[in-house]
Amino acid sequence: MAVTACQGLGFVVSLIGIAGIIAATCMDQWSTQDLYNNPVTAVFNYQGLWRSCVRESSGFTECRGYFTLLGLPAMLQAVRALMIVGIVLGAIGLLVSIFALKCIRIGSMEDSAKANMTLTSGIMFIVSGLCAIAGVSVFANMLVTNFWMSTANMYTGMGGMVQTVQTRYTFGAALFVGWVAGGLTLIGGVMMCIACRGLAPEETNYKAVSYHASGHSVAYKPGGFKASTGFGSNTKNKKIYDGGARTEDEVQSYPSKHDYV
């Protein structure tokens, strides 16, 4: 039961985290105009990974996309790449983890396969979370570096700037969303990896012993599954002997005296 709970919780936490990473990537408020110790402006500037926006005092908001690739700094491109890689890995991880969930039964998938898939998705979530945290941190570092620049324009080299002292940029809401989301995805990934250990069939030192049932041929292997003939009530591949620990949600079944010859 604990393994299923850990796996399920890991999935949910990662799902929330990846949704947050997607939200942060799409948000416009990666950097916002610093209002502290600045002249009071009748406009509020904020910038995202894809466009910059200006909200005027009338409430009118105008956003302009960065329609250039070559004109943007390498750091911004790197942040975009990290966030996209994080989203892609997270999405793949989510897809894999859905099939790996203990509570979902797909065909005759063995626990060992589910364990491997859980581990794979866990690693993907961890890398996804790290990508998001790295991306947000790189952007934050870029902001700190540019904070005291007199031109007050983070994206230098995008055209003739008039010297102004009107705008400095500070951390926007998207950075905090990204950090939290990245952290959640990372935690979810770790939980999936922990769950994987509980799912994996434990190895035993003694050899498999074959028992012959009176009715039809059934083999029992330590840590294995009951061999199904395709008849009767054994089509669900319930584990009947694993030579060790067993989770609460598994159906317990022991060989009866009639199974021995």
């Epitope: 402006t41 009748a42 406009v43 904020y46 926006c53 005027e56 009338s58 324009n153 055209g159 008039v162």
Partner: antibody, heavy 120, light 113 residues
Framework: EVQLVESGGGLVQPGGSLRLSCAAS????????MHWVRQAPGKGLEWVSY????????YYVDKLKGRFTISRDNAKNSLYLQMNSLRAEDTAVYYC?????????????WGQGTLVTVSS | EIVMTQSPPTLSLSPGERVTLSCKSS????????????LAWYQQKPGQAPRLLIY???TRESGIPARFSGSGSGTDFTLTISSLQPEDFAVYYC?????????FGGGTKVEIK
């Protein structure tokens, strides 16, 4: 048609108080920020105060802070300017003006003004 | 606060002439966020309220004749009337629309010669 009509002006003694009103019509008043601008006789325009559509933020010209208070009642489509401790230099025509939308913060509609005379 | 300086204070001209009014601000009115200038021009006739002519330094307000045009960026701005009409004799004000307080220039009076 957008209309702004100021009222409440008149003769007041130095140190006295006056409350100016501006009745708005022809537009959704609650969606627009509003300004007060004044013009002393024979002088240029002087911006006084601004209030946003939701009553926050509010801005004043530094020299009038503490004496003048801008407010609005969106239910009544009205803008107000409470003027206290009036001085002779406050004598002017007071205009209310609308903060235009998508006009780079310019004042796109103005009332005809109300004259405030501070004299003993 | 931003100081707006208009020159000349008075211009004596004849109808049909080209008019160029100057406005300088003590600080750049170019907002780097959208690369737009926040400067407006107003026309005021005696006994009337001001009327918005130009916003964003160069955009004509709806209903304003094409003979009025604005230009400039940063700290230096110009209002041009290509061919002065009798109804254009008035006082013209420029205004900083980027920083509070939203200061006005002292005005330029365009009078008939």
């Amino acid at each position: 048609e957008v209309q702004l009509v100021e009222s409440g002006g008149g003769l007041v003694q130095p140190g006295g108080s006056l409350r100016l009103s501006c009745a708005a019509s022809g537009f959704t008043f609650s969606s627009f920020g509003m300004h007060w601008v004044r013009q002393a006789p024979g002088k240029g325009l002087e911006w006084v105060s601004y209030i946003s559509s939701g009553s926050s933020p509010i801005y004043y010209v530094d020299k009038l802070k503490g004496r003048f208070t801008i407010s609005r009642d969106n239910a009544k489509n009205s803008l107000y300017l409470q003027m206290n401790s009036l001085r002779a230099e406050d004598t002017a025509v007071y205009y209310c003006a609308r903060a235009g939308y998508a006009v780079r913060n310019a004042l796109d509609y103005w009332g005809q003004g109300t004259l405030v005379t501070v004299s003993s | 606060e931003i100081v707006m300086t208009q020159s000349p204070p008075t211009l004596s001209l004849s109808p049909g002439e080209r008019v160029t009014l100057s406005c300088k601000s003590s600080q750049s009115l170019l907002n780097v966020g959208n690369q737009k200038n926040y400067l407006a021009w107003y026309q005021q006739k005696p006994g009337q309220a001001p009327r918005l002519l130009i916003y964003g330094a160069s955009t004509r307000e709806s209903g304003i004749p094409a003979r009025f045009s604005g230009s400039g960026s940063g700290t230096d701005f110009t209002l041009t009337i290509s061919s002065l009409q009798p109804e254009d004799f008035a006082v013209y004000y420029c205004q900083n629309d980027l920083f509070y307080p939203l200061t006005f220039g002292g005005g330029t009076k365009v009078e008939i010669k």
